[in-house]
Structure formats: structure tokens, C-alpha cells
Amino acid sequence: TPLGPKWPEPVFGRLASPGFPGEYANDQERRWTLTAPPGYRLRLYFTHFDLELSHLCEYDFVKLSSGAKVLATLCGQESTDTERAPGKDTFYSLGSSLDITFRSDYSNEKPFTGFEAFYAAEDIDECQVAPGEAPTCDHHCHNHLGGFYCSCRAGYVLHRNKRTCSALCSGQVFTQRSGELSSPEYPRPYPKLSSCTYSISLEEGFSVILDFVESFDVETHPETLCPYDFLKIQTDREEHGPFCGKTLPHRIETKSNTVTITFVTDESGDHTGWKIHYTSTAQPCPYPMAPPNGHVSPVQAKYILKDSFSIFCETGYELLQGHLPLKSFTAVCQKDGSWDRPMPACSIVDCGPPDDLPSGRVEYITGPGVTTYKAVIQYSCEETFYTMKVNDGKYVCEADGFWTSSKGEKSLPVCEPVCGLSARTTGGRIYGGQKAKPGDFPWQVLILGGTTAAGALLYDNWVLTAAHAVYEQKHDASALDIRMGTLKRLSPHYTQAWSEAVFIHEGYTHDAGFDNDIALIKLNNKVVINSNITPICLPRKEAESFMRTDDIGTASGWGLTQRGFLARNLMYVDIPIVDHQKCTAAYEKPPYPRGSVTANMLCAGLESGGKDSCRGDSGGALVFLDSETERWFVGGIVSWGSMNCGEAGQYGVYTKVINYIPWIENIISDF
């Protein structure tokens, strides 16, 4: 019996009846055994077939068998109702071997030419299964030359039998206070050969409640308790189960905060499994009663362990625990059924007594001493000498606990001194110095510190003066002795002020002319404004209209008089402004260097002389009356002039203050 090729030789070839293509002889029997590699099968088809036809192919035949199974018995040329010829059919071995038997009987009625067939090994696709047959693999089947392998979906692992997918269903821990868990794939059939462990682990104080929901279907047995697949529930106190069958188990109140659920399946069956909805309970806390003027959120029927509530106060009320304010309040229910902190109060917001207003006063509008939410107070400034800056002085106690103006400001209003008030009524031109009366020049400041000089009060804590008058003290501001509120230079009755800082114009160069001869002194304390101490106004933009040539300004000071001594009493002189070109020309003759008079200066005095400021008046203000506001303002600062004061054809030279308004404002706002 020819065996034909065997693996590992190439498995393919040709088979033919003896004598083919001639007729075959009688009484022939020939057998071929073909063997393919493992995982392969054999394919056979006929290119020629001509055998004697007989009933059920009893005389001559070709028989194909694979193992114990006969695949076909073939004869004739074409198939009939009871006999089969191969025609164009292809035959496949069931495994990796195929037996072919050819037999002819003792006679042929006519010559038959037999058969010719071709065979070859081909890969078996193990992944294709006939309808109704169990699939090769649980999840995914992968064919390859000579074999196949199985793989599993995510969340599964291939069992050691290499075909079944076991669920990776252990180690899941549920920590929420409620939730759902189910058998893998629920409500589809659960996987075979799996062992699942689920844990519910809640904080101590909680008790887990298990409810089986929807459907329950776990493989069972009529006589033995859950021998195949089963569900078990374990707590630190007891074990529940095993459960199987089709009946939903009853609710399980575990009285435990930890539960372990075990689900084990075998290799067979087709069941949908189970679903559990779990909840938890704990000892409830006392129901929170909101304090007056407050409310609780969230509102719940009951509050148990870990539940919390917050208190929110109505507008105008604040959370207080005794005297201590809280921005927020949240209490948490503890395992022993008590809240972790006591209820606060919602107390009406109290803005407290309003701050005192320097140079002003406060009046309670709502009621005497009422400082709670929506209470109104009215600030006002001391009349005559102070005026309120920016706001109207009305403040309301707002919900944030701050007194707040109608403009939303939480800071105090400012009582700003009224500037430019004087007791003096201007008369006509007066030739020669006059003695000042009380209240005539309340801005006048006497500066002592090496030499005698003057200055003018600005606001209530600044003095405007000449740079040359305080140059020596620029680094030792505290050496300046500043006096105000007096007419007599040597009087012991005056208001003392001390300097905190001296600011000399950066464009001023000492001993090199008097351009930019301007300085500011910051006082270390505010002075109290009254009829004898009042600041001078700074010039408005429109001030130039009151400072034209021949307009009268007034200079005051304790400087040298005609007698050559410093004045004991404050003196003043009314002098007209001199045309700038005329003044420039007056100081272009020797001994004055060219360009002595700059655009930052103005000149005042009489051509005939006799009225002038002099040494000791330096830094004092040359003031003008603004007839629109009826306030005095500083137009010039006593700076320099001829060696002989009041000399004919020479004039007093003053720093032109209007040119320095930005400089003054910047320093005052910065410091």
C-alpha cells in the first residue's frame, strides 16, 4: 500500500488508478495514506473519474476515509440517486490524515479509464465552527498556519485550558455610601471558570444594606446546595449564602461597615447572574434647627454620619460663635450621632462706633449710638475752617460690617482746611510797610534755623517756601524751628511745628542764580486750623487773570524794614506786578549776570521804589485775591532782588508759583 508523502515533506501530489490514462485491470486494490502536519488537513479533488457504475458502488469504487469516518464512496461517471461520482467536488480530511482506497472487481462490461486526483495539505481554520457547535474560543479566536489561539476581552484572562475566558473580577472596592454591583456581563450570561471578589468598605459607623434587584439566575442543582456556581456574602460578624437558583435573595442588613461578596463559576452553564444595589445607614444626628435670621442648607429628612449642613445668614446678619466672627459654618455628623460643632448665631451686623473724624464730628442719624446694619451716621467738618473733601459725609452700616459712604468708600471722609481766608479787606495802594492785624495773614509761617525766613502754610501739614531759605537744612529737617499763628516774631505765644522732610526743587542750584527757587516742607503733624492759622490757596488755572501787569499782590514778613532791623511785628506791603520785560531789563545791568530773571519768576514793586520785600522775608508768599472765589492764593514766593531793598528802578523778584503746580501736587500726593 503506497503511503504517499508524510510531513515534514511537502504534502501535495497526484494519485491515479493503475494504468491511467489507460483502462484499469480487474481485481485491483490500491490504498494510499496521506498525512499532513498537525493543524493542517488534506484537500483532494478529481480531474478525471471513470469507474464502473454499480448499485451502491459495490463493484468498482474509490473510498475516501479520515480516521474511522468514511467521507465518500465513489463510482460511475456522474452521480445518481444512490451512487456518487466526485464531479467537481472537493474533499477534506477531518484531521491531518486521509485514506484513499481504489478497488476493481473481477470483471468490467466495458473498459474504464479509472481516475486521476490531486491532493494538497492546507491549514485548518479552527475558528470556523458549524452552526450549533460550541465555539472554539470563549471570546476571540485567532487562526494561523498549523493552529489557532484564543484571547480575551479586557477585564478577562485566559484560563489554563487555553479556551475559556475567566473574568478579572477581584479586588474591586466600593467606598461610596451607596452603589451597585453585579456579576460580570450582567444581564448577559456570566463568564465561566471565574472567581470574583467584591469589597464594600465604608467608614466606621456606617452599616451596609444589600438588596438583590431585577433578576437572579445562578446555576443550581436540584439536590445539592449550589455545587456549580455560587454567591457568598461575608461580614466581620457572619456569612450569608451560598446563593444560587432563580429566586431573588431577601434584603441583607449586615450591621457592618465592611462586606465581602464572593462569586465562583464553573466551566459550564449559561446563566445571567445577579445585581445588588447597596445602601448604608448610620445613627442619625439631631435635626439642625436654624438660628434666627439664618437657614440650614441642604435640607434633608435626616442627617447621618458624614452628612453635613451649612448655616447661611440673611443679608445684614453675620455668623458669630460668641464674639468670634466666622465667614462660613459647616457642621458634620459624627459616628456617635452628634454634630462636630455647636450651632452659631446669626447676629445683626454691628459696624461698631464710627472712627473719630479729625477736624470734624459724627452724628448718629438712625438713633443715639445705633451702629447696626443699615444704621446711618453723618460726618461733618468744623465749620468755617474745614470743608469735606469728595463725599457728603453720609455713611451707612453695610452688610460687610463697614461704614460705607454713598460712593462706596470705606475710608473716612477728609476734612480739608479751607484755604485763602483772611480778615483783611483790601484797601487802595499803601506806600510803605503796614503792620498786620490778627487774621490778616494766617498762612504766614516763621522759619528759624540759622537765618530768619518765611513760608506759607499749604493744607494743614505742608509749608511752601523758597529753596534758598532752607537749603542748608535739606539734610537735617528737624533743625528747622517752624512757628505759626503769631504776629510778633519774638512772642512766646505761637503754634510750634516741626519738619519731617524738606523737598527742594531738583532744578534749583544753590549760589548759581535763583531759577526754581521753590521748596516744600512736610510737617510731622497736622496743625489745627483756626482764624490765626489758615492755609493759603494754590493758584487755579485761571489765576493768571489776577496776576497781570499792575495787578496788586501782597507780600508779608518779618524781614528788614527801612530802619535796617528785622521787624518785631508782621509787616505787609501791597505791590503791583511789573511787566516781565521791564524787570528783565532792570537786572541785565551789572552787577547782575545776564539771564538773572527767568520765565519762572515774576517781579513786583514800584518803579520809584520804597515798597519791597527784604532779607528775612525770603520764602514768604506774594498773595493775590481771586475775586471769583474770594479766596487769597499764592502767586509768588519771595526770592531775591537788589542789594538795597526798595531801590528805585529795581524790583522784588518772586518765584512764579503757577509754573510749579504739577511739582507741588506730585510731591504732596507722593509723600
Partner: antibody
């Protein structure tokens, strides 16, 4: 963790002002609570001086009201104590603290008032 | 001002004993009372707030009770590390005030 740290001069002359800083880490002073200054005199007597709340409002011990000021710098998460016109009676260890349900104290800073 | 009176300046006890420190307010302070423990060279450490609420990390042998004007700090099973001075404090109204302190001595 919330931490409070006091800082300032250990010696102040009578009639001068005492200025202390409390630097807070781990919690914003605008988030909640009242931020207090407390002092402990030799002999261990404790005195509450005042607080500045999360909103910036202040409350002072009436016995100190004319001399005390508590302010804050929210950008630096600091609050400050200024006590004016000090005398030898103000010699103490000064603490900054949050009181009530969140209770943290600084380590304290010793201040001596002496000429 | 509300005066918080701790009448006992010193208390002597043994390890394992139970001891009660008392504090009396001169007027009603509701439950707005805190208790502090201060060891030498350290800043005060809060034990109890709102009369009976224990701060986290405070051993449960420390318990507070009382309301209105009478308050008690109880230490059950006293330990050697409890040697300290104990202060009560009211925060019901301005000014907040402290008791004068009770020193606990271990026999």
C-alpha cells in the same frame, strides 16, 4: 498645616510704639476666622488684645482701645499689631492665634519694655 | 468684663487618677468656652472648644462640660505628660477673657 509665626523687636523703649508681625502659612487670612493677638505677662496671666477678621474688621480689648491698632497685608498673608505709648507694664510674650474651631497659636515672641 | 475664675491655683493628682479642673464665669457665656493646656516654655495648646467639643488629635481622656457660668475640664486616667497649666477662656463677648490658670502636679 496652618502655621503662625510672630516677629518683631524684643526690646522697646517706654513711650515708643511696639510693632509685631504675624506671618501665616498654610491658610489664607481672608478665607475665614478671626486673627488674634494675645499676650502673656510674667506670671502667666493671659490677656486677649484684639483681632482682625477675615473681612478686615477689627475688635479690640477696650482696655487697650486708645493704644492698639491691628492691620493686615493680604498679599503677604500677614497681620500686624501696633501698640502705642508702651510702658514697662507691656512687657510680655506676645502670641498671634486663630481661636475657636480651628485653633492655632504661634510660638510667641518675648517683648521687654525698658529704657 | 467677664471674669473667669479658676479657684484652684494648684491641683495634685496621681498617674491613672481622674481629675476635674473648674472654671466659673461672672456672667452667662452660653457654651462659648475653650480650655487650653500650657507646658513650660511652650505656647498654649487648645484642648476643648464650645465647652465640650474636643479638638482633633486631643486624647479622649480630656472631656469638657458645662454651660452658662460653670465649666469643668475632666482628665480621666491622668498621664505623666498631662503635667501642665490649664486655662479656661470665654469668647462670648468683648473682651475675650482667660482664667488665671490651674497648675496640675503629678504626685
Amino acid at each position: 498645616d496652618v502655621q503662625l509665626q510672630e516677629s518683631g523687636p524684643g526690646l522697646v523703649k517706654p513711650s515708643q510704639s511696639l510693632s509685631l508681625t504675624c506671618t501665616v502659612t498654610g491658610y489664607s487670612i481672608t478665607s475665614d476666622y478671626a486673627w488674634n493677638w494675645i499676650r502673656q505677662f510674667p506670671g502667666n496671666k493671659l490677656e486677649w488684645m484684639g483681632y482682625i477678621s477675615y473681612s478686615g474688621r477689627t475688635s479690640y480689648n477696650p482696655s487697650l482701645k486708645s493704644r492698639i491698632s491691628i492691620t493686615r497685608d493680604t498679599s503677604k498673608n500677614q497681620f500686624f499689631l501696633q501698640l502705642n505709648s508702651v510702658t514697662t507694664e507691656d512687657t510680655a510674650t506676645y502670641y498671634c492665634a486663630i481661636l475657636y474651631a480651628m485653633n492655632f497659636w504661634g510660638q510667641g515672641t518675648s517683648v521687654t519694655v525698658s529704657s | 468684663d467677664i471674669v473667669m475664675t479658676q479657684s484652684q491655683k494648684f491641683m495634685s493628682t496621681s498617674v491613672g487618677d481622674r481629675v476635674s479642673v473648674t472654671c466659673k464665669a461672672s456672667q452667662n457665656v452660653d457654651t462659648n468656652v475653650a480650655w487650653y493646656q500650657q507646658k513650660p516654655g511652650q505656647s498654649p495648646k487648645a484642648l476643648i472648644y464650645s465647652a465640650s467639643y474636643r479638638f482633633s488629635g486631643v486624647p479622649d481622656r480630656f472631656t469638657g462640660s458645662g454651660s452658662g457660668t460653670d465649666f469643668t475640664l475632666t482628665i480621666s486616667n491622668v498621664q505623666s505628660e498631662d503635667l501642665a497649666e490649664y486655662f479656661c477662656q470665654q469668647y462670648n463677648s468683648n473682651p475675650l477673657t482667660f482664667g488665671s490658670g490651674t497648675k496640675l502636679e503629678i504626685k
